[in-house]
């Protein structure tokens, strides 16, 4: 008999699974650059904003070149689980200027999850190590003003979609490799 | 120092109109979502509206959802509450209160709201 | 009738510690900060803990937060005489759109 109804298919492929993966980073990266847009039209953003606690961006056209798996996943599982924090404080503690925006934040939080749960799955079944234990993760500080976590959402959104696009560039390119 | 001061408040009969007042001062008060809380005599606080640092975004208790209105004038660096169709039950101590999130920091010494006939 | 709820009074002697549960449900508690204010008699209100746990400068060490699931708690050690007060828990409600307290709870320091 085959596996129990539900339980996660075991590839063979890992093109497939990559693919997968490449379609939900698209898919987060299109919900990502929609709610950045709506940020922008609803609160509009004076110029770029940063935020000390999100991380750097990881790759660039310069990197594409030397990719390597291992590399690359490990890295965009740990960049994504910062930014999941992230979200996930805005959600809690930004008070009620983005309440506004609580569906679509929420749906991203959810997406996020999906897309680190997704990625956990395919370095294990590429066998690849596992990412060691998250550093503790430093407490995001209280926004100082509404104001600032305005700011602070423009530089979420807006980083997080850096990160995707040059993720699924990435992923599209180690697929090339496989 | 941080400082908000309330006032307008006074004795009104049922179904009249009020305008509170809060001054705000010590902090770049467009950079800040405001509140008002009330406090009924011998009773708990009960939030009453919450308006957004730039002033589009407001959100109302049912309580005086349709009856009270709460605006800011950012140049002025003050908040206000409409209150009509005022009611027994709004009688109160009124206190505006700013917030950096979700919660209030700072608070005024409040005004005090007595409808009665 | 409060969203929150919090026992309408407690009790200690001094130097004692002494726990106000406040408890709520997921729209609230359950996916919002919460925060604890002390109200003197004749006073404003003063914000005495916010983002669960975190006290603001000013406030001693002897007031701490705590949060599980759908409850909060707010303990205080080495109670003192002028911790006589009424202390209030609260969070954003999403269901409400709006800010929720509890009815609050009568601190009373004996002897």
């Known amino acids: 008999p085959g596996p129990p109804a539900g339980s996660p298919r075991v590839s063979s492929d890992p093109r497939a699974d990559l693919d997968s993966a490449v379609l939900l980073t698209r898919s987060l990266l299109a919900d990502t650059r929609q709610l950045a847009a709506q940020m922008r039209d609803k609160f509009p953003a004076d110029g770029d904003h940063n935020l000390d606690s999100l991380p750097t961006l990881a790759m660039s056209a310069g990197t594409l070149g030397s990719l390597q798996l291992p590399g690359v996943l490990t890295r965009l599982r740990v960049d994504l689980m910062s930014y999941f924090r992230h979200v996930q404080w805005l959600r809690r503690a930004a008070g009620p200027s983005l309440k506004t925006l609580e569906p679509e934040l929420g749906a991203l939080q959810a997406r996020l999850e999906r897309l680190l749960r997704r990625l956990q799955l395919l370095m294990s079944r590429l066998a690849l190590p596992q990412a060691a234990p998250d550093q503790p993760a430093v407490p995001l500080g209280p926004p100082a003003s509404a104001w600032g976590s305005i700011r602070a959402a423009h530089a979420i959104l807006g980083g997080l979609h850096l990160t995707l696009d040059w993720a699924v560039r990435g992923l599209l390119l180690l697929k090339t490799r496989l | 120092q941080v400082q908000l001061v309330e006032s307008g408040g006074g004795v009104v009969q049922p179904g009249r109109s009020l305008r509170l007042s809060c001054a705000a001062s010590?902090?770049?008060?467009?950079?800040?979502?405001m509140h008002w809380v009330r406090q009924a005599p011998g009773k708990g606080l009960e939030w009453v509206a919450v308006?957004?640092?730039?002033?589009?975004?407001?959100f109302y208790a049912d309580s005086v959802k349709g009856r009270f209105t709460i605006s800011r004038d950012n140049s002025k660096n003050t908040l206000y509450l409409q209150m009509n169709s005022l009611r027994a039950e709004d009688t109160a101590v009124y206190y505006c209160?700013?917030?950096?999130?979700?919660?209030?920091?700072?608070w005024g010494q409040g005004t005090l709201v007595t409808v009665s006939s | 009738q409060s969203v929150l709820t919090q026992p309408p009074s407690a009790s200690g002697t001094p130097g004692q510690r002494v726990t106000i549960s406040c408890s709520g449900s997921?729209?609230?508690?359950?996916?919002?900060?919460v925060s604890w204010y002390q109200q003197l008699p004749g006073t404003a209100p003063k914000l005495l803990i916010y983002?669960?746990?975190l006290r603001p400068s000013g406030v001693p060490d002897r007031f701490s937060g705590s949060k599980s699931g759908t409850s909060a708690s707010l303990a205080i050690s080495g109670l003192r005489s002028e911790d006589e007060a009424d202390y209030y828990c609260?969070?954003?409600?999403?269901?409400?759109?709006?800010?929720?307290f509890g009815g609050g709870t009568k601190l009373t320091v004996l002897g």
């Open positions: 209160a700013r917030t950096p999130g979700f919660h209030f920091d700072y």
């Open positions: 983002y669960d746990d």
């Open positions: 010590g902090f770049t008060f467009s950079h800040y979502d």
């Open positions: 308006i957004s640092y730039e002033g589009s975004n407001k």
């Open positions: 997921s729209s609230n508690i359950g996916s919002n900060y």
């Open positions: 609260s969070a954003w409600d999403d269901s409400l759109s709006g800010v929720v």
